[in-house]
């Protein structure tokens, strides 16, 4: 399912998983949006368990999740930290 | 530079408790994503992993040592440790610390220190 | 836990020879597999990561690849410096488990 490396393009995750990352296991979001060598959207997600993972970020349960973080984010102290990563 | 070094006593009998010190530089254990993790390979033959212990003091062990092993950190030294109580033979091997980087790609044990022989006898 | 077999364990090939070492994984580790070179006397330095995926400053010869769950390196020409243990890791799931190592000697 997942594979990530170094590519040409400079693109952190050459496959991505769509199944679902549950919200109490996700410990950190990265979204880093095209640029510096890199044609696509990358979503990165940290677990708890100590994993890294590369998600595809037309997922529709991570639009939802990424919702939901972001409203929280406003109200209280957000669950799982969302970086939107800059494209240098 | 990422360098990582290992300390330890080199002999001790079975029994005793093994006290094993990884200092390194180049990164620091206070990082969001950082590890360190230690294996150990008997002379002539493959690696074992022991345990990983992580920035935010997560750790994790090897189950076939988990009740005589322990992994702890030292942030404002740049140490981690490793010890493994009531030695035997069995334990006689060079004992290696390893970085290990929450990173996209992920590669676990991507800087090793030198290692450090570590003999169990009467 | 996870059991990584590695196959041969010693292996003795002339320069210029095309190489493979395998190791097949107990359960599914998803491409979550590193090769390691070590040397005599040195510590292990990661060759392949992800199963398929040169880490910087290996050279092209190596290279790796993966059937069902049968992981392998492949070294296309055999040269006299890749004389070395080689070990795969599964990072999959705790505990981490490696192969038992194959050492590559030279005819």
């Known amino acids: 399912i997942l594979e990530a490396h170094y590519t040409n393009l400079k693109c952190r995750c050459s496959g991505v998983i769509s199944t679902v990352v549950g919200l109490n296991i996700i410990d950190r979001i990265q979204v880093t949006p095209p640029g510096n060598g890199c044609p696509k959207t990358e979503v990165v997600i940290w677990t708890k368990m100590k994993k890294v993972i590369c998600v595809n970020p037309r997922a529709k349960w991570l639009q939802r999740l990424l919702r939901h973080v972001q409203s929280k984010s406003l109200s209280s102290t957000p669950q799982a930290p969302v970086s939107k990563r800059r494209a240098a | 530079q990422v360098t990582l070094k290992e300390s330890g006593p080199g002999i001790l009998q079975p029994s005793q408790t093994l006290s094993l010190t990884c200092t390194f530089s180049g990164f620091s254990l206070t990082t969001y994503g950082m590890g360190v993790g230690w294996i150990r390979q008997p002379s002539g033959k493959g690696l074992e992993w022991l345990a990983n212990i992580w920035w935010d003091d997560d750790k994790y062990s090897n189950p076939s040592l988990q009740s005589r092993l322990t992994i702890s950190k030292d942030t404002s030294n740049n140490q981690a440790f490793l010890t493994i109580t009531n030695v035997d033979t069995a334990d006689t091997a060079t004992y290696y610390c390893?970085?290990?980087?929450?990173?996209?790609?992920?590669?676990?044990?991507?800087?090793w220190g030198q290692g450090v022989r570590v003999t169990v006898s009467s | 836990d996870i059991q990584m077999t590695q196959s041969p364990s010693s292996m003795s090939a002339s320069l210029g020879d095309r190489v493979t070492i395998t190791c097949q994984a107990s359960?599914?580790?998803?491409?979550?597999l590193i090769w390691f070179q070590q040397k005599p006397g040195r510590s292990p330095r990661p060759m392949i990561y992800?199963?398929?995926n040169l880490a910087n400053g290996v050279p092209s010869r190596f290279s790796g690849s993966r059937s069902g769950s049968d992981y392998s390196l492949t070294i296309s020409s055999l040269e006299s410096e890749d004389m070395a243990d080689y070990h795969c890791l599964q990072f999959k799931q705790y505990p981490f488990t490696f192969g038992s190592g194959t050492k590559l000697e030279i005819k």
């Open positions: 992800y199963a398929t």
């Open positions: 390893a970085r290990s980087e929450l990173v996209m790609p992920y590669v676990p044990f991507d800087y």
């Open positions: 359960q599914d580790i998803d491409n979550h």
